[in-house]
């Protein structure tokens, strides 16, 4: 079951998944000037059996100018720098990730990949939040959001995180020392506390799972 909407936005925070549940789809997006090869799949799919999960299909990009060839164009120095950053970060992420049953790791970057990764998450997916550079985390509970299904609808739980002030950023799980969060209040109370308004429906969007995609910055 795909999640109908995207995870909550927290001011001055970003989020990522440590691992992706089977059924997750990742769009094969290419950077400007490149396009998906004609025979290529439009997305990668996290699939698996009882012992191993992996991404089905591989994303491939080709130059928009080179109509009849899949020959890769040598990146310009600027692109090379960007590509290297992506590669390094991807390797760090892969090193950080634990092998969770029924989950795929972050897919490695592909040649001329777009800077944005568009995921279609499934019920049960967890994403983790951290404050951006220059902000520190105030925790009321776990800095994570889970896509869950209740009453036949999907929604993301509200992460118990506020980012404030000038200091070092907090870490995602698996990156150096994860910040210890103080004991949270019971869910019945925290759920009513987590936003400044008395909102149960956080940022609801009337969208169908066919049309809704979730975008995360990948750079």
């Amino acid at each position: 079951e795909l999640c109908d909407d995207d995870p909550p936005k927290i001011t001055h925070a970003t989020f990522k998944a440590v691992a992706y549940k089977e059924g997750t789809m990742l769009n094969c997006e290419c950077k400007r000037g490149f396009r998906r090869i004609k025979s290529g799949s439009p997305y990668m799919l996290c699939t698996g059996n009882s012992s191993h999960s992996s991404w089905d299909n591989q994303c491939q990009c080709t130059s928009s100018a080179a109509r009849n060839t899949t020959k890769q164009v040598t990146p310009q120095p600027e692109e090379q720098k960007e590509r290297k950053t992506t590669e390094m970060q991807s390797q760090m992420q892969l090193a950080d990730q634990v092998s969770l049953p029924g989950h795929c790791r972050e897919p490695p970057p592909w040649e001329n990949e777009a800077t944005e990764r568009i995921y279609h998450f499934v019920v049960g997916q967890t994403v983790y939040y951290q404050c951006v550079q220059g902000y520190r985390a105030l925790h009321r509970g776990p800095a994570e959001s889970v896509c869950k299904m209740t009453h036949g609808k999907t929604r993301w739980t509200q992460p118990q995180l506020i980012c404030t002030g000038e200091t070092e950023p907090s870490q995602f799980p698996g990156e150096e020392e994860p910040q210890a969060s103080p004991d949270g209040l019971p869910e019945s109370e925290t759920s009513r506390l987590v936003t400044t308004t008395d909102f149960r429906i956080q940022t609801e969007v009337a969208a169908t799972m066919e049309t809704f995609i979730f975008t995360t910055e990948y750079q």
Epitope: H151, E187, E189, S191, F199, R200, I201, E204
Partner: antibody, heavy 118, light 106 residues
Framework: QVQLVQSGAEVKKPGASLKVSCKAS????????MHWVRQAPGQGLEWMGW????????RYAQKFQGRVTVTRDTSISTAYMELSRLRSDDTAVYYC???????????WGQGTMVIVSS | DIQMTQSPSTLSASVGDRVTITCRAS??????LAWYQQKPGKAPKLLIY???SLESGVPSRFSGSESGTEFTLTISSLQPDDFATYYC????????FGQGTKVEIK
Amino acid sequence: QVQLVQSGAEVKKPGASLKVSCKASGYTFTGYYMHWVRQAPGQGLEWMGWINSNSGDKRYAQKFQGRVTVTRDTSISTAYMELSRLRSDDTAVYYCAREGAGDAFDFWGQGTMVIVSS
Amino acid sequence: DIQMTQSPSTLSASVGDRVTITCRASQSISSWLAWYQQKPGKAPKLLIYKASSLESGVPSRFSGSESGTEFTLTISSLQPDDFATYYCQQYNSYSTFGQGTKVEIK
């Protein structure tokens, strides 16, 4: 304090339509889903459907598809449940209920008794 | 549809008794189960949500537990105010309720 106040009891003839209102107060109406549940005399609880009070998105139980319509008017913080082509077995108390922090129904209306009889 | 089988349908007990009511789901519902108390002529009142979380303001003598697809509501020491009908509700898929358990005075 949170309150859900429903419209009064009604007597309807078979084939007629019914519209029950549920006025919410004491909380941000558009921040919560509203559900409708009914209970026939001496029977158990039966879920009918829900509405997202913010977007207006709605879902209905299979049993009531095509007969039930749930709407809301955010300007007056009121949800409505309309049931058409009434039959005698639609005689029941109809409740609106707010879906709360734990995803269960934390506040209920007082109920609206509806008798369908010729 | 997910079916909820609640037992017993009627339970005779005395003040001070420990009472347990069981609800079995026809398939996995994670922990998306609630318990309600209803008195004649009144709307149901939420006691437990998410299988074991106690709703605010509900006495601690009420507790919920789960084991797979079987869920239990326990009243540790029955009080005069607890004689009522109790319903379980699954809300993983579209909501369905158990048939109810009437707790009456022995």
